[in-house]
Interface confidence: low
């Protein structure tokens, strides 16, 4: 079934930017669909993006449009989280999903931390 | 391989009638993960290349006229032509994307009833 | 606008080789799996080869009835998809078509044909 | 946006008791006959993990004490009987359209 691995994430000023990676140790990455999903402190879980097969599909939740960018290597098995214009409530767990339809594969999330 | 088996090879119907295209794979291309049948159909005119009418088994490509439409799961599908026009003469073909060694049906050719 | 434009199609004698082009425009061509599908005269359409995008390393799929004689590339520089047919047969004559491959695997853009006539 | 309303947003049910989330969404997830519904658990400290797709369908490694229910719009996870191990927060999730979105949680504790 294969494991996600998210990393990138740390403590980063308001306004900066942090690049968050997802290494899939699965033998299917490039067959499926891949999502971030992000829990802020105490919350519920928001869907942020995801990515096709292929990488020439992509969908973003209004709220990060313009300022979160989703890419993929199928050659690495790897998915990328690129977050610009941090803002304070971008603070949460940033969780790497495999996504069928259903999230099926999560990864163990990755702690993005936006404060002065 | 997955086999596409069209029928009827040929069928005649006439104008304003409705014209139904079946088409039958060797396995399901119903994907359990998302519920999805990954089957197209193609119409193809004289001398030009198949053009795209209906994929996911039923959802119609844009600009397609309303009267095509798909239905179908798992292993039996269907392309119905609700009220057939002169210009929907044609040969139509079913595929299956169920897997990257994609495979067509054999093709049935529509003629009008005179 | 997606275009797809194939050539080097013609009369070729039995045994003989030819390479099938395919100029692409219209889109990011490195985004897209390309295919190549073909027609013999009156006959149903049969998918031959496929290759894949640049997210997935340019990867080939072959339909097993070709037996190794058919080669498809890609030129990224100039978006050209090749079509290498070696050991040509008299069956192997038919419409060759250029297919553009869509993100949910159907084929979305088709070329209008190249013809092959394969003769003594 | 297809918003899903979770009810109630927290439970406390007595060991051996059987427990009933719900989530009702905006509109209709239904497609090519299929619920595009699904259920998570989420323990203190660790990623949601898949209970239920496709509205009815247990993921393989759920208890047995695990079901799903319902279509359309209104759609319910049992637990059934409660057991001490199901402590956590539970999430239905819609992928019938784009933006994906979740209900707000429910919290499950033993009374």
């Known amino acids: 079934e294969g494991q996600l691995v998210e990393s990138g994430g740390g403590l980063v000023q308001p306004g900066r930017s942090l690049r968050l990676s997802c290494v899939d140790s699965g033998f299917s990455f490039s067959n499926n669909w891949m999502s971030w999903v992000r829990q802020s402190p105490g919350k519920g879980l928001e869907w942020v993006a995801n990515i096709n097969e292929d990488g020439s599909e992509k969908h973003f939740v209004d709220s990060v449009k313009g300022r979160f960018t989703i890419s993929r290597d199928n050659v690495k098995n790897s998915l990328y989280l690129e977050i610009n214009s941090l803002r304070v409530e971008d603070t949460a767990v940033y969780y790497c999903v495999r996504n069928n339809s259903y999230f099926n594969v999560w990864g163990q999330g990755t702690t993005v931390t936006v404060s002065l | 391989d997955i086999v596409m088996t069209q029928s009827p090879d040929s069928l005649a119907v006439s104008l304003g009638e409705r014209a139904t295209i079946n088409c039958k794979s060797s396995q399901t291309i119903l994907h359990r993960r998302n519920n999805k049948n990954y089957l197209a159909w193609y119409q193809q005119k004289p001398g030009q290349p198949p053009k795209l009418l209906i994929y996911w088994a039923s959802i119609r490509e844009s600009g397609v006229p309303d009267r095509f439409s798909g239905s179908g799961s798992g292993t039996d599908f269907s392309l119905i032509i609700s009220s057939l026009q002169p210009e929907d003469v044609a040969v139509y073909y079913c595929q299956q994307y169920n897997n990257s060694l994609c495979s067509f049906g054999q093709g049935t050719k529509l003629e009008i009833k005179r | 606008e997606v275009k797809l434009v194939e050539s080097g199609g013609g009369l070729v004698q039995p045994g003989g080789s030819l390479s099938l082009s395919c100029a692409a425009s219209g889109f990011t061509y490195t985004d897209y799996y390309m295919n190549w599908v073909r027609q013999p005269p009156g006959k149903a359409l049969e998918w031959l080869a496929l290759i894949r995008n640049k997210a997935n390393g340019y990867t080939t799929e072959y339909s097993a009835s070709l037996k190794g004689r058919f080669t498809i590339s890609r030129d990224n520089s100039q978006s050209i998809l090749y079509l290498q047919m070696n050991a040509l047969r008299a069956e192997d004559s038919a419409t060759y078509y250029c297919?553009?491959?869509?993100?949910?695997?159907?084929?979305?853009?088709w070329g209008q044909g190249t013809t092959l006539t394969v003769s003594s | 946006d297809i918003v899903l309303t979770q009810s109630p947003a927290s439970l406390a049910v007595s060991l051996g008791q059987r427990a009933t989330i719900s989530c009702r969404a905006s509109e209709s997830v239904e497609y090519f006959g299929a619920s595009l519904m699904q259920w998570y658990q989420q323990k203190s400290g660790q990623p949601p993990k898949l209970l239920i797709r496709a509205a009815t369908n247990v993921e393989s490694g759920v208890p047995a004490r695990f079901s799903g229910s319902g279509s359309g719009t209104d759609f319910s996870l049992n637990i059934h009987p409660v057991e001490e191990d199901d402590i956590a927060m539970y999430f239905c999730?819609?992928?019938?359209?784009?933006?994906?979105?979740f209900g707000g949680g429910t919290k499950l504790e033993i009374k």
């Open positions: 297919v553009r491959e869509n993100i949910n695997y159907y084929f979305d853009y």
């Open positions: 999730q819609q992928s019938r359209k784009v933006p994906w979105t």
